[in-house]
């Protein structure tokens, strides 16, 4: 008889989830020499251990600690790029600017990017039918807790000048409820981080406003300054050429680094 399974509001675990995580791990460790020592089977076991046979609305950051330990990775100072509500552009940026890292350019972020997963209490099965939705079901679900955990760690280990890419087309350019606003901002370490520089990406072709004067950016500046970290903000006008360079990084004018 088919066992009764709780119906959640979110989509179920991504198909072929174990194989995907393992394959991504192997690929990442092959491409990044500094992570060659990582045993991908152990990584998968630690990942699995964080959520398998656990009630998917009761996951804690503690559950992910073995995985975090195995995936420890050092991002060089001045090379951390945070983002909020502008993921694709941030990732396109680091695809060209190879020496800079978003969370998803690190091993743990790369493993989980765009994936969904959850298990169920008291069974070793993965739930491919449905998983808890952050809003409709619970916030302490496997995916949300994972990103909160690794985002916290990513921010804690950042050093030097940290950059953040923000979406100037959003009504809240800085959103206190985003992962950046609720986790990363509060876990930058003042003794290691000299400054946070925000890049506000303009969407409109003729939007000449100074979006660094936006009230939400002023709020970000206030939070950062109170933590004794210097804050800078730049309007990124005319991003079209930047986007062209993303498509054609061999263009001679795209090769000059930051």
């Amino acid at each position: 008889l088919p066992r009764w399974r709780q119906q959640w509001s979110g989509s179920g675990t991504t198909s072929r989830f174990p194989e995907t995580v393992l394959a991504r791990c192997v690929k990442y460790t092959e491409v990044h020499p500094e992570m060659r020592h990582v045993d991908c089977q152990s990584v998968w076991d630690a990942f699995k251990g964080a959520f398998i046979s656990k009630y998917p609305c009761n996951i804690t950051e503690e559950d992910y600690q073995p995985l975090v330990k195995l995936g420890t990775q050092t991002v060089p100072c001045n090379k951390t790029l945070l983002w909020s509500r502008i993921k694709d552009l941030a990732h396109q940026f680091t695809q060209v600017q190879r020496d800079m890292f978003t969370l998803e350019d690190t091993l743990l972020g790369y493993l989980a990017d765009d994936l969904t997963w959850c298990g169920e209490f008291n069974t070793f099965e993965i739930n491919y039918q449905s998983c808890p939705d952050w809003r409709k079901d619970c916030s302490n679900n496997p995916v949300s807790v994972f990103w909160k955990t690794v985002s916290r760690r990513f921010a804690e280990t950042a050093c030097g000048v940290v950059h953040v890419m923000l979406n100037g087309s959003r009504s809240k350019i800085f959103d206190k409820n985003s992962t950046f606003g609720s986790v990363e901002v509060h876990n930058l370490q003042p003794e290691k981080v000299q400054a946070l520089e925000a890049w506000v990406i303009h969407g409109g072709r003729e939007d000449s406003r100074d979006l660094c004067q936006d009230p939400t950016i002023k709020e970000l500046e206030s939070i950062i300054s109170k933590r004794n970290i210097r804050f800078f903000c730049k309007n990124i006008y005319r991003p079209e050429k930047f986007l062209q360079c993303v498509k054609n990084p061999e263009d001679s004018s795209c090769l000059s680094g930051i």
């Epitope: 600017q97 730049k234 079209e240 360079c245 680094g257």
Partner: antibody, heavy 122, light 107 residues
């Protein structure tokens, strides 16, 4: 090597028209935005107008909006500035300049022509 | 629109440091470039993106930009640095230049 050569300047009466040209060579003209910048005798630089590499967007300083039109012919490697309803205060050396982009977010003028003098006087 | 204000003139002894300011409302939120113009010549970019030096520009030229002021610094100023200097910035629709500063190298 990159070369920008302006032509078409001269003496014109107030209210008159003039068309400036800028012949570009030594680079792929169709890949670069272009600008006109002017400098009145003994005065500072004033940005006039900008056109995207493919001609899709044009921008003007408030002082010339509605009177000047920037255009380009990528097949001829030439930039133009059509100047109508000219005034005495438009008297200046007019430079064309190449819009340089540097990864990730920087724009500036990296090559300039030697300029052509436009004198508006009765 | 952006408005950029520069001092009309700055004097410096050879070998000393010259600083040319460019002030504008929250100019630190935008990128600034600097141009050198010698008499009868077209301008030449010496700094772009606040503090980047194009190839061929001597290391003595540097830039900074925060708050309401961008600054061009010339360390160990030489006689050949005597020229007019213009700051410039841009937004989505406009480019703009400061009024220019005449740098005089004394002696």
């Amino acid at each position: 090597q990159v070369q920008l050569v302006e032509s078409g300047g001269g003496l014109v009466q107030p209210g008159g028209s003039l068309r400036l040209s800028c012949a570009a060579s030594g680079f792929t003209f169709s890949s670069y935005g272009m600008h006109w910048v002017r400098q009145a005798p003994g005065k500072g630089l004033e940005w006039v107008s900008n056109i995207y590499s493919d001609g899709s967007n044009t921008f003007y300083a408030d002082s010339v909006k509605g009177r000047f039109t920037i255009s380009r012919d990528n097949s001829k490697n030439t930039l133009y500035l059509q100047m109508n309803s000219l005034r005495a205060e438009d008297t200046a050396v007019y430079y064309c300049a190449r819009n340089m982009y540097r990864w990730p977010f920087h724009y500036f003028f990296d090559y300039w022509g030697q300029g052509t003098l436009v004198t508006v006087s009765s | 629109d952006i408005e950029l204000t520069q001092p009309p003139s700055v004097s410096v002894a050879p070998g000393q440091t010259a600083r040319i300011s460019c002030s504008g409302d929250n100019i630190g939120n935008k990128y600034v470039s600097w141009y050198q113009q010698k008499p009868g010549q077209a301008p030449v970019v010496v700094i772009y993106g606040d503090n980047n030096r194009p190839s061929g520009i001597p290391e003595r030229f540097s830039g900074s930009n925060s708050g309401n002021t961008a600054t061009l610094t010339i360390s160990g100023t030489q006689a050949e640095d005597e020229a007019d200097y213009y700051c410039s910035s841009y937004d989505s629709s406009y480019f703009v230049f400061g009024g220019g500063t005449k740098l005089t190298v004394l002696g």
